[in-house]
């Protein structure tokens, strides 16, 4: 565990940048900053979650522009922005800093916010190192800042993964060794038996796995029942003789302000009541003015610190502050090996060669996966396909209604009528046949094939 710290030094127009403040004719304003940390150095979608954490600064001093004056560096909030991280520090990360303007004029519905600048840096940074300085430009604006990552004891090291206690500690916990004088690092603990629980087991000799109170089993993964003390062996309470449950990550409830604690592998997670957020629900008195809804969530209510706010999350996000991304791709909606891309506002499938469609459901190369609608049949050849449509339909999938009479199929002045199963020709006197193609002799006999029984010349002839 540890804390990422960001110090903003200045924010103002860069060289050759905005000659005047953007606040003109907007009344008094003030700045605040939002920092977002994402693991890794890869290009990530802007709406992907701040998986390492996020933080909001306090509001800066109120600023009113002097008419026609050049824009100076703008007054900044006091203090550091701190983003606590629970697990190991990844070393490589993306740092996103947003500069927001809050307008304090007489706005309907309260203050208005707008994003002035956003900078993204991909960085390598070891925990415990010195402050790193940076200057970034976003449009006409220039942001100067420093940052560092520091571990919180007992964690030490460049990734905050080694555990250490001061040398004066009377007893080290499981797997801990006292720090050597004047050193930040500590001795590496012995390698325990493979699979020994990191939470409930420890070792003093390589290959062993000794259990904390309240845990048993060869790998210290079995909780000891406290309902009965009979027949139990192991470390016991001096008062009852019973095994004492070992300390868990939720012991003492690390969640402040009424948050409820739940254990996660190797750590804990706080579920915060409305009005509070942060790793331990320690950020309190939050209102919509603090912009607590991440990832484009809409904040409602919470006009003052005593009333709760609610975040209405956009599609793809959840959590009391819209801080958790819903992994809709886990449902594997893309067929035939398609790649699922969760864009936040929508899912997209990028289809493998030979497949297409919104979910890669169409096979481009043969008729196996291709549906021809309305009785059409798929014809393939040479690696290609096409739909041969039933009469009255057209288009690539035979979904479009075609006018069967458009081609004037009825010969010799016959009248064409569209029919649900095709077309019907009403022949002019003296002609018969499906398309009125056969002249009728005066004796009522056609010159070519005889009319089907029951059909007289002039009767409508249906052409299937």
């Amino acid at each position: 565990a540890g804390v990422f710290e960001l110090q903003i030094h200045s924010f103002g127009p860069g060289p050759g940048g905005a000659p005047r403040s953007p606040y003109s004719a907007r009344g008094p304003c003030r700045l605040f900053f939002r920092v977002c940390l994402k693991p890794g150095l890869s290009e990530e979608a802007a709406e992907s979650p701040c998986a390492l954490g996020a933080a909001l600064s306090a509001r800066g001093p109120v600023y009113t522009e002097q008419p026609e004056a050049p824009a100076p560096d703008l007054p900044l909030p006091n203090g550091l922005l701190q983003v606590p991280f629970r697990d190991a520090w990844p070393g490589t990360f993306s740092l996103i800093i947003e500069t927001w303007r809050e307008e304090l004029g007489d706005q309907i519905g309260g203050p208005a916010w707008s994003l002035l600048a956003r900078v993204t840096r991909r960085r390598r940074l070891a925990a415990g190192g010195p402050w790193a300085g940076d200057i970034q430009r976003a449009g006409a604006w220039e942001l100067r800042f420093s940052y560092r990552a520091r571990c919180e004891l007992p964690a030490v090291g460049t990734a905050c993964t080694r555990l250490c206690r001061p040398r004066s500690a009377s007893r080290c916990g499981p797997g801990l060794r006292p720090c050597a004088p004047l050193e930040d690092e500590c001795e590496a603990p012995p390698v325990c038996r493979a699979g020994c629980s990191l939470e409930h087991g420890f070792c003093e000799q390589p290959g062993e796995c000794r259990c904390l109170e309240g845990w048993t089993g060869p790998l210290c993964m079995v909780p000891v029942s406290t309902s009965s003390c009979l027949g139990l062996r192991g470390p016991s309470s001096t008062t009852t003789g019973c095994l004492v449950p070992g300390p868990g990550p939720c012991d003492g409830n690390p969640c402040a302000n009424g948050g409820s604690c739940s254990e996660t592998p190797g750590s804990f997670e706080c579920t915060c009541p409305r009005g509070f957020y942060g790793l331990r629900c320690e950020v309190s008195g939050v209102t919509c003015a603090d912009g607590p809804c991440f990832n484009g969530g809409l904040c409602v209510g919470g006009a003052d610190p005593d009333s709760a706010y609610i975040c209405h999350c956009p599609p793809g996000f959840q959590g009391s502050n819209c801080e958790k991304r819903v992994d809709r791709c886990s449902l594997q909606p893309c067929r035939n090996g398609g790649l699922c891309l969760d864009l936040g506002h929508a899912l997209r499938c990028r289809c493998r060669a030979g497949f297409a469609g919104p979910r890669c459901e169409h096979d481009l190369n043969d008729c196996a996966g291709r549906a021809c609608a309305n009785g059409g049949t798929c014809v393939e050849g040479g690696g290609a396909h096409r739909c041969s449509c039933a009469l009255g339909f057209g288009g690539r999938d035979c979904r479009e209604r075609a006018d069967p009479c458009a081609a004037r199929p009825c010969a010799h002045g016959g009248r064409c009528y569209a029919h649900f199963s095709g077309l019907v020709c009403a022949c002019a006197p003296g002609y018969m046949g499906a398309r009125c193609e056969f002249p009728v002799h005066p004796d009522g006999v056609s010159a070519l094939p005889a009319a089907p029984p029951g059909l007289r010349p002039g009767d409508p002839q249906r052409y299937p």
Epitope: R352, A353, A356, R396
Partner: antibody
Framework: EVQLVESGGGLVKPGGSLRLSCAAS????????MSWVRQAPGKGLEWVGR??????????DYAAPVKGRFTISRDDSKNTLYLQMNSLKTEDTAVYYC??????????WGQGTLVTVSS | DIQMTQSPSSLSASVGDRVTITCQAS??????LNWYQQKPGKAPKLLIY???NLETGVPSRFSGSGSGTDFTFTISSLQPEDIATYYC?????????FGGGTKVEIK
């Protein structure tokens, strides 16, 4: 990093033969459909043909002007794509590009190799 | 075969201009269309896939739209490095076919 490197181009007489190779790296070659695309000097792009991955049948498809004369093959153990060109004509003169066709697009291209058919 | 007709065949525009190229298919190809950029002496590069989706790493000034038979490719603000020939390509049916290309130059 995906890399495709063509080789084997050169000058050949009409009616002659030539074999182009494409060495692939930076991706799982055996899973990927591959294609050849050509470009005559000063002209546009023309698809020559493709070969599917073995898992998708390994079949080949060709454009009409080269069908029966050109053969595409692959050696997955060597991560190499081949284009065997027989009965070459002057109109086959072009830069030949080897392309990865994993998605329904020519995602990555080699630098190309020039084939000149002239007497 | 599906014919792809691109227009104009060439155009000249100033830096910062909005540039639009059209591509028309001889039959309905749904959104089964890609756009490529080819700079002089270089291999083509995929910019847009499935008619409107920007390939990873491609600047957002490039965009595509359309479905069926009519498609549009747009550069919202032309930059000097955009001097190239742009091609559309359909994958609805074999043979895979390209448009004739549009050469974009700076005034």
């Amino acid at each position: 990093e995906v890399q495709l490197v063509e080789s084997g181009g050169g000058l050949v007489k009409p009616g002659g033969s030539l074999r182009l190779s494409c060495a692939a790296s930076g991706f799982t070659f055996s899973n990927t459909w591959m294609s050849w695309v050509r470009q005559a000097p000063g002209k546009g792009l023309e698809w020559v043909g493709r070969i599917k991955s073995k898992s998708d049948g390994g079949t080949t498809d060709y454009a009409a002007p080269v069908k029966g004369r050109f053969t595409i093959s692959r050696d997955d153990s060597k991560n190499t794509l081949y284009l065997q060109m027989n009965s070459l004509k002057t109109e086959d003169t072009a830069v030949y590009y080897c392309t990865q066709y994993y998605w329904n697009s020519f995602d990555y291209w080699g630098q190309g190799t020039l084939v000149t058919v002239s007497s | 075969d599906i014919q792809m007709t691109q227009s104009p065949s060439s155009l000249s525009a100033s830096v910062g201009d909005r540039v639009t190229i059209t591509c028309q298919a001889s039959q309905d190809i749904s959104n089964y269309l890609n756009w490529y950029q080819q700079k002089p002496g270089k291999a083509p590069k995929l910019l847009i896939y499935d008619a409107s989706n920007l390939e990873t790493g491609v600047p957002s000034r490039f965009s595509g739209s359309g479905s069926g038979t009519d498609f549009t490719f747009t550069i919202s603000s032309l930059q000097p490095e955009d001097i190239a020939t742009y091609y559309c390509q359909q994958y609805d049916n074999l043979p895979l076919t390209f448009g004739g290309g549009t050469k974009v130059e700076i005034k």
